[in-house]
Interface confidence: medium
């Protein structure tokens, strides 16, 4: 039997054991988060699968993910949303300590998909473990990119109160309009629910002289946010290690001075 022709994409293929990983993560999440104990993980996997299986992987839409989004509906208390851009690791360390704040990856759907890749093939029930479309080289409407765009939009839309965003001060563009934060989340914060956006600009080392809140890209972010009738604040986090430590132990004497 001749092997069936398979589309070759530029990106890496579906993460090995993808179905098992998603199902296991779902079970673990619902066990740890009592408010989600009603979630049927088999239904979640079926909805996830239904979003991309048998579909041309360059023609995925946000609509494809709506059944999954519906099953994974979760609310974050006001003032407790933490967005991030190009600094996922620190944002996640922060919410591991500050347990009452949440990144997208602390929510069920973000947790299920974090660091995973997936895609299917048109008109077959197979998962493509060989290659998946690359956002730049192949297409932007691929299963992974559309998923993150969909859930990021929803996460931003449901945020309320003061929303925080962690930005990487080591980058040439501290605020990047092409990032998920810059292209999706910023534009989906709801002015009638969100009073303010507070940016935390994370410095890369011990050089505490520069005020990165004066960076032109931060001014651009301030302009975008202000035009949407949301107040904007910015803080330099000069010592990220101290910042994490002081979140853990705010009473420490060294935390009374600036971080």
């Amino acid at each position: 039997v001749l092997p069936r022709w398979r589309q070759q994409w530029s990106g890496s293929g579906t993460t090995s054991r993808f179905p098992e990983t998603v199902l296991a993560r779902c079970v673990k999440y619902t066990e740890v988060h009592p408010e989600m104990r009603h979630v049927d993980c088999q239904s979640v996997w079926d909805a996830f699968k239904g979003a991309f299986i048998s579909k041309y992987p360059c023609n995925i839409t946000e609509e494809d993910y709506q059944p999954l989004v519906k099953l994974g509906t979760q609310t974050v208390p006001c003032n407790k949303t933490l967005l991030w851009s190009r600094i996922k690791d620190l944002a996640h360390q922060f919410t591991q300590v500050q347990r009452d704040m949440f990144t997208l990856e602390d929510m069920l759907l973000g947790y299920l998909a974090d660091d995973l890749t997936w895609c299917g093939e048109f008109n077959t029930f197979e998962i493509n473990y060989q290659s998946c479309p690359d956002w730049r080289k192949d297409c932007s409407n691929n299963p992974v990119s559309v998923f993150w765009k969909t859930v990021s939009r929803r996460f931003a839309e449901t945020a309320c109160g003061v929303v925080h965003v962690m930005l990487n001060g080591s980058r040439s563009k501290i605020f990047d309009k092409n990032s998920t934060f810059g292209s999706v989340e910023v534009h989906n914060l709801q002015p009638e629910k969100v009073q303010a956006l507070e940016a935390w600009v994370i410095h890369g080392g011990r050089e505490d002289s520069r005020d990165l809140c004066q960076d032109p890209t931060i001014k651009e972010l301030e302009s975008i946010i202000s035009k949407r009738n949301i107040r904007f604040f910015c803080k330099n986090i000069y010592r990220p290690d101290k910042f994490l430590q002081c979140v853990k132990n705010p009473e420490d004497s060294s935390c009374l001075s600036g971080i």
Epitope: D89, L90, Q93, S170, H203, G204, G205, R206, E207, S209, R239, P240, D241, K242, L244, Q245, N249, D252, S253, S254, C255
Partner: antibody, heavy 118, light 109 residues
Framework: EVQLLESGGGLVQPGGSLRLSCAAF????????MNWVRQAPGKGLEWVSS????????GYADSVKGRFTISRDNSKNTLYLQMNNLRAEDTAVYYC???????????WGQGTTVTVSS | QSVLTQPPSASGTPGQRVTISCSGS????????VNWYQQLPGTAPKLLIY??QRPSGVPDRFSGSKSGTSASLAISGLQSEDEADYYC???????????FGGGTKLTVL
């Protein structure tokens, strides 16, 4: 592949000088604070010096202050340690290691041996 | 004499759980994040734990914790390949320096 490669070690007489280099590959060198850590034969790890991402801040262990100078060239992805007025107690394997302030020193070189002896 | 104090040696049999302690002061362990490094014989140190987290590739048998001015590294399900020297490290605000523990030599019996 992410790696650091040290060079420049060798045998030198007390009072002599050496310059160690550490070449970085596979990561954005200019995003990381860099360090030199040494280990004397049969002993534990001892921090020697650190330099911030652009080089505006440097720190030294008391044992090397005034004798060693750390520097970096971000355009060449290279870290340096100029060691002057070397003493027998400076004999050690010298490692360079990168540092991100919420990660720790997560990439280490293989080390270069400095022997100070007459 | 190291600023951070570790026991010079520790041992355990395969499958056992072993804990290595690291004692310091408010200017280092209490006020800053603690890292743990593993050094296998004849090799460079390797980051094992940062901020009580494991870098990718480090087995979940290794865990770190901190309480006040002390930190500890726990290794469960001990394996022969865990035989190595283990070092704790933290930034010291008073010394303006990285400080390391003297190291603990772990023997798997």
């Amino acid at each position: 592949e992410v790696q650091l490669l040290e060079s420049g070690g060798g045998l030198v007489q007390p009072g002599g000088s050496l310059r160690l280099s550490c070449a970085a590959f596979g990561f954005t060198f200019s995003d990381y604070e860099m360090n030199w850590v040494r280990q004397a034969p049969g002993k534990g790890l001892e921090w020697v010096s650190s330099i911030s991402i652009t080089g505006s801040w440097t720190g030294y262990a008391d044992s090397v202050k005034g004798r060693f100078t750390i520097s970096r060239d971000n355009s060449k992805n290279t870290l340096y340690l100029q060691m002057n007025n070397l003493r027998a107690e400076d004999t050690a394997v010298y490692y360079c290691a990168n540092y991100k302030s919420y990660y720790g020193m997560d990439v280490w070189g293989q080390g270069t041996t400095v022997t100070v002896s007459s | 004499q190291s600023v951070l104090t570790q026991p010079p040696s520790a041992s355990g049999t395969p499958g056992q759980r072993v804990t290595i302690s690291c004692s310091g002061s408010s200017s280092n362990i209490r006020n800053n994040l603690v890292n743990w490094y593993q050094q296998l014989p004849g090799t460079a140190p390797k980051l094992l734990i940062y901020n009580a987290q494991r870098p990718s590739g480090v087995p979940d048998r290794f865990s770190g914790s901190k309480s006040g001015t002390s930190a500890s590294l726990a290794i469960s399900g001990l394996q022969s390949e865990d035989e190595a020297d283990y070092y704790c490290a933290a930034w010291d605000d008073s010394l303006n320096a990285w400080v390391f523990g003297g190291g603990t030599k772990l023997t798997v019996l």
